[in-house]
């Protein structure tokens, strides 16, 4: 079981950043840490996607991962895909600092993210509270502004 | 259950330097982002800034800055605040708090009084 | 910066009266929205993130609304141990700001 792993967030625009995760144990919570760059101030979604696949840029990546086909939702609640890690701010020089515990998303098992895209989004995830269909798939968070595939570290 | 406990009350002269800690346990101290917020006496809450201790990365709100340094030790799991050139309006309760962002501030130390009399 | 203001600065109420504290908020926020409480002697206590989701462990009759710029924390019937102070913060931008809080006395 890989305990490390690792994700280059690179997108079109100027916005890249470097993503570590650490699970110390196989049913454990992962550590997910590191620092973003060039996005504009606020909050941004930051989800884990489907497939590794970046042939065409960071749409390739297809919808959050949903193994267990639930409805969109934020890092805290019950209902939310695997793959939903919630926002991340950037300051007024663009820059996101993450540091996020979560005990959904494994480096191993079924909801093993190795091999997978993770990715930082225009706009803010409503967590599914924005009373649209969109919110419910999305969070509203927007266009795909940068993305990597993440891959077991050493 | 993650707790914080913070240091004891402090008496400082004006001009003096002033070093509070705030130390976690039972949870993950590394993970988290740890905030400092202070209230003098008759007023509200205010945000001095905030560290990441993982990262060892922090901000700063604009009117502390220069006077104010967070670090934290995540060997002892332990973040400390030092606020320099202290004059008597920062007599004041000094909180850290575990900051999870746009989830809020949900645990926080007990307090610590800092009194800055001549 | 963003400025929280919040109305009224303190309010008097008997147990088992709905109270309602606004805040508003300089600029949009969309739901990015705190609300706590605080007593006198005590650390804050988280209430109310995302403007609306309650925190666990709190009782069902504190709620919150809004979005944008306008925000509501209600308390359904107020309980004697409601009596403190209570503070919005955004979570929208650093750096986090709060609002100059409202007491919620007996009358």
């Known amino acids: 079981m890989a305990t490390k792993a690792v994700c280059v967030l690179k997108g079109d625009g100027p916005v890249q950043g470097i993503i570590n995760f650490e699970q110390k144990e196989s049913n454990g919570p992962v550590k997910v840490w590191g620092s973003i760059k060039g996005l504009t101030e606020g909050l941004h979604g930051f989800h884990v996607h489907e497939f590794g696949d970046n042939t065409a840029g960071c749409t390739s990546a297809g919808p959050h991962f949903n193994p267990l086909s639930r409805k969109h939702g934020g890092p805290k609640d019950e209902e939310r895909h695997v793959g939903d890690l919630g926002n991340v701010t950037a300051d007024k020089d663009g820059v996101a600092d993450v540091s996020i515990e979560d005990s959904v998303i494994s480096l191993s098992g079924d909801h093993c993210i190795i091999g997978r895209t993770l990715v930082v989004h225009e706009k803010a995830d409503d967590l599914g509270k924005g009373g649209n269909e969109e919110s419910t798939k999305t969070g509203n968070a927007g266009s795909r502004l940068a993305c990597g595939v993440i891959g077991i570290a050493q | 259950q993650v707790q914080v406990v913070q240091s004891g009350a402090e008496v400082k002269k004006p001009g003096s330097s002033v070093k509070v800690s705030c130390k976690a346990s039972?949870?993950?101290?590394?993970?988290?982002?740890i905030s400092w917020v202070r209230q003098a006496p008759g007023q509200g809450l205010e945000w001095m800034g905030r560290?990441?201790?993982?990262?060892?990365?922090?901000k700063y709100a604009q009117k502390f800055q220069g006077r104010v340094t967070i670090i934290a030790d995540k060997s002892t799991s332990t973040a400390y605040m030092e606020l320099s050139s202290l004059r008597s309006e920062d007599t004041a309760v000094y909180y850290c708090?575990?900051?999870?962002?746009?989830?809020?501030?949900?645990?926080w130390g007990q307090g610590t009084t800092v009194t800055v009399s001549s | 910066d963003i400025q929280m203001t919040q109305s009224p600065s303190s309010v008097s109420a008997s147990v088992g009266d709905r109270v309602t504290i606004t805040c508003r908020a300089s600029q949009g926020i969309s739901s990015w929205l705190a609300w706590y409480q605080h007593k006198p002697g005590k650390a804050p206590k988280l209430l109310i993130y995302?403007?609306?989701s309650l925190q666990s462990g709190v009782p069902s009759r504190f709620s919150g609304s809004g979005s944008g710029t306008d925000f509501t924390l209600t308390i359904s019937s107020l309980q004697p141990e409601d009596f403190a102070t209570y503070y919005c913060?955004?979570?929208?931008?650093?750096?986090?700001?709060f609002g100059q809080g409202t007491k919620v006395e007996i009358k």
């Open positions: 039972g949870g993950t101290f590394s993970s988290y982002a």
């Open positions: 708090a575990r900051d999870q962002d746009y989830y809020g501030m949900d645990v």
């Open positions: 995302a403007a609306s």
């Open positions: 560290i990441i201790p993982i990262l060892g990365t922090a």
């Open positions: 913060q955004q979570t929208n931008n650093f750096p986090w700001t």
